[in-house]
Amino acid sequence: PEPPTACREKQYLINSQCCSLCQPGQKLVSDCTEFTETECLPCGESEFLDTWNRETHCHQHKYCDPNLGLRVQQKGTSETDTICTCEEGWHCTSEACESCVLHRSCSPGFGVKQIATGVSDTICEPCPVGFFSNVSSAFEKCHPWTSCETKDLVVQQAGTNKTDVVCGPQDRLRA
């Protein structure tokens, strides 16, 4: 028969014949011959290959370097890479999560709209009228001004986006 010019899925063409690719988690040792199938062997400890392949070397699992604030979120297998995330209070600087930075804090006058995760930074928003934040925090939302009326008090000092209102007793001299 004519030697093939193309091969089926999960095969590759070598020396005018179609050989099976190695399955995920295994590397190529030797191509198939007319007598034997492709020779594949398992990836070693801390190695992986995540596709059908003809790689002669497995890839090393990613190292989650604690010196960069990283920790293991999901341990790698022979078919998957290790997934890193950041230590508490830190988040990844990129999608690949190769290093971490400290979560940003929201300054006074701003509150936390979305708390940071291992992969995203804190999202801050300005405190709208009626709300304030007097601290720099990565967790605190804007707080509503105190309602003096519900305490039978009156506003003595107006609130700002950074300060609460100051309530005081009602002026008893007024009729």
Epitope: I14, N15, L28, V29, S30, D31, T33, F35, T36, E37, E39, L41, P42, G44, E45, T56, H57
Partner: antibody
């Protein structure tokens, strides 16, 4: 069809080194590993190590670590096995074979270590 | 790693079946489905007759069969012929790019 042709017999003195060659023809040289196996007279097979011609990476059996070196020359499709600090008990037939599976073998090279 | 354990000898009459065992550990035979068997006639290089536990290279007769259970692999030669008289070796992948052989079994056809 892959063919492996080895160099000829050698006689060596204790303490010296020997270098055996294994020339491959047929197939793509860089697409299969080469294992080295030895067999002392009247004894069984002993795996010594392997070399991956595509990158030249090697893996040696613990017993031979520090004494064996496997190299390759892609221009001549040849791999080499060098064994140093020879002792009389290294007298054996040395074989090269294709892959870990060893589905094709060289004809063998007799190395005699004698004073 | 130490050698796999094979019986030093086995025998059978023509037409009979004979089984050769190959015992390893949970780090080699038990851990991987990468057991091979070789036949070696005196003065010749070994010849692969079984790979990946039970597969036969094209051209190897189906009189040669093999299996594995736990840490032990087995080779069965059925319908014994005079030319089957040879040494038989098993090998197993042992992880980390290492391979280990059995000590060999001399098969005699009576």
């Amino acid at each position: 069809q892959v063919q492996l042709v080895q160099s000829g017999a050698q006689v060596k003195k204790p303490g010296s080194s020997v270098k055996v060659s294994c020339k491959a023809s047929g197939g793509t040289f860089s697409s299969y590993a080469i294992s080295w196996v030895r067999q002392a007279p009247g004894q069984g097979l002993e795996w010594m190590g392997m070399i991956n011609p595509s990158g030249g990476t090697t893996s040696y059996a613990q017993k031979f670590q520090g004494r064996v070196t496997m190299t390759r020359d892609t221009s001549t499709s040849t791999v080499y096995m060098e064994l140093s600090s020879l002792r009389p008990e290294d007298t054996a037939v040395y074989y090269c074979a294709r892959g870990f599976r060893m589905d094709q073998w060289g004809q063998g090279t007799l190395v005699t270590v004698s004073s | 790693q130490s050698a796999l354990t094979q019986p030093p000898s086995a025998s059978g009459s023509p037409g009979q079946s004979v089984t050769i065992s190959c015992t390893g550990t949970s780090s080699d035979v038990g851990a991987y489905n990468f057991v091979s068997w070789y036949q070696q006639h005196p003065g010749n290089a070994p010849k692969l007759i079984i790979y990946d536990v039970r597969k036969r290279p094209i051209g190897i007769p189906d009189r040669f069969s093999a299996s594995k259970s736990g840490n032990t692999a087995s080779l069965t030669v059925s319908g014994l012929q005079a030319d089957d008289e040879a040494d038989y070796y098993c090998s197993s992948y042992a992880g980390n790019n290492n391979l280990v052989f059995g000590g060999g079994t001399k098969l005699t056809v009576l």
